[in-house]
């Protein structure tokens, strides 16, 4: 019995179906086929879970969180024992193993390993201003998404006709910050932050209002 090499890893957007491949060759009839799919979740590597089981001509559910979402892609028994997972969740990310036994065929490699990564587009980022908006002050524009896998990068731009940040601004696309030093009236206006990763983008708008000093009455 020999389980075929599988692609190292599969990426899928959250909510979409994933197919985890596993095929094998055998010299025996498929009368005593026994297939166990296991997962070692990324979120809990010490706690492997059973995903689905085929034994004695019957299918059995694995861990409760997979109930109703998992099945074999083809009619069993077969030499293609790939499975699908519907409505993938972040917690489905992990290393999946198919363990195949088909007595009396023993020996050879009977395990196939596939990694699954569930990708999440950036959630709507939160835009905010840190610091005084008085003229001459330094401000930081903050942008962060609570969700996003891979981790989003953040691009700030000022919505004027240059689409460029003020000349006194420095941007950190990893942290999602823009520091604008010595703000002036020309720093005022509408800014857009775009959070993006491999599978999506999300934006927020922020309004910077630089406050000019009020003339003081003397007397």
């Amino acid at each position: 019995l020999e389980v075929s090499e599988s692609p190292g890893s599969i990426q899928v957007a959250r909510g979409q179906p994933a197919v985890l491949p596993c095929t094998f060759t055998t010299s025996a009839a498929l009368i005593n086929l026994n297939v166990i799919w296991m997962v070692t979740p990324l979120s809990n590597a010490n706690q492997p879970e059973q995903v689905i089981l085929y034994q004695g001509g019957q299918m059995f559910d694995g861990a409760p969180r997979f109930h109703g979402r998992v099945g074999f892609t083809g009619t069993m028994p077969a030499t293609n024992v790939s499975i699908f997972i519907n409505n993938t969740q972040l917690s489905d990310t992990g290393t999946y193993q198919c363990l195949v036994n088909n007595l009396p065929d023993i020996g050879g490699r009977n395990i196939g390993v596939t990694g699954l990564t569930v990708l999440v587009p950036p959630s709507a980022p939160h835009c905010q201003i840190q610091g005084s908006q008085d003229i001459g002050s330094d401000v930081i524009l903050l942008c962060s998404s609570e969700e996003g896998i891979p981790r989003p990068t953040y691009l700030w731009e000022k919505l004027d006709n240059t689409l460029k940040l003020p000349p006194t601004a420095t941007q950190d696309q990893v942290q999602g910050t823009v520091t604008i030093r010595n703000i002036s009236a020309l720093s005022s206006g509408l800014y857009q932050c775009v959070a993006s990763n491999a599978i999506g983008t999300s934006t927020c708008l922020l309004d910077l209002q630089v406050i000019s000093p009020q003339p003081r009455n003397i007397g």
Partner: antibody, heavy 121, light 110 residues
């Protein structure tokens, strides 16, 4: 209550420049936080955003019209203006001035009555 | 060509509930939500709701806005003759970097 009122010629010849002014009353353009915009509506059709100006003079135009648009502000008169160059019959529309702000998620909460501009020789 | 798609016309009976739809993409409605505007013949548009179901003061409680994915909806219950108007949706498009509008839906109250 903020009010906006458009004014300008109702007829412009092709290839000339369309010029409109919006006068704001009941609020100051200089108060900040507001994006003073021009939006147009072709006869019997939908709306098209042209561009905005901030009280500081910072402008931002619809990329599809950018090459022909100029918006300016006169805070002393509480007015902002639109110039659209090289007009053709396709620029015939009702032109509205409008205001957007943070409080309405940058959507347009106050509109002028609109002025019909016809491009014809 | 409008950036958002709306059915050109819809008809409902007096007192019925109308649901108007507006379809965009992930860069506009899917990202930012949508605003709804009402326009009576010969009048400027009036903002009804923004960012899905927020609304300016003084707007009828018979109106409700929502979003599902890239589609925004406006529901008007207990239709009155004064609800007969054109309805436009609008959204900020982060890719075009512009406010975009739908082509409008003419609502007729029978």
């Amino acid at each position: 209550e903020v009010q906006l009122l458009e004014s300008g010629p109702g007829l412009v010849k092709p290839s000339q420049t369309l010029s409109l002014t919006c006068t704001v009353s009941g609020g100051s353009i200089s108060s900040g936080g507001y994006y003073w915009s021009w939006i147009r509506q072709h006869p019997g059709k939908g709306l098209e955003w042209i561009g905005y100006i901030y009280y500081s003079g910072s402008t931002y135009y619809n990329p599809s019209l950018k090459s022909r648009v100029t918006i300016s502000v006169d805070t002393s008169k509480n007015q902002f203006s639109l110039k659209l160059s090289s007009v053709t019959a396709a620029d015939t529309a009702v032109y509205y001035c409008a205001r957007a702000s943070r409080s309405t998620d940058y959507y347009f909460d106050y509109w002028g009555q609109g002025t019909l501009v016809t491009v014809s020789s | 060509q409008p950036g958002l798609t709306q059915p050109p016309s819809m008809s409902y009976g007096l007192g019925q509930t109308a649901t108007l739809t507006c379809t965009g993409n992930r860069n506009n409605i899917g990202d930012q939500g949508a605003a709804w505007l009402q326009q009576h013949q010969g009048h400027p548009p009036k903002l009804l709701s923004y960012r899905n179901n927020n609304g300016p003061s003084g707007i009828s409680e018979r109106l409700s806005a929502s979003r599902s994915g890239n589609t925004a909806s406006l529901t008007i219950s207990g239709l009155q003759p004064e609800d007969e108007a054109d309805y436009y949706c609008s959204a900020w498009d982060s890719s075009l970097r512009a406010w975009v509008f739908g082509g409008g839906t003419k609502l007729t109250v029978l």
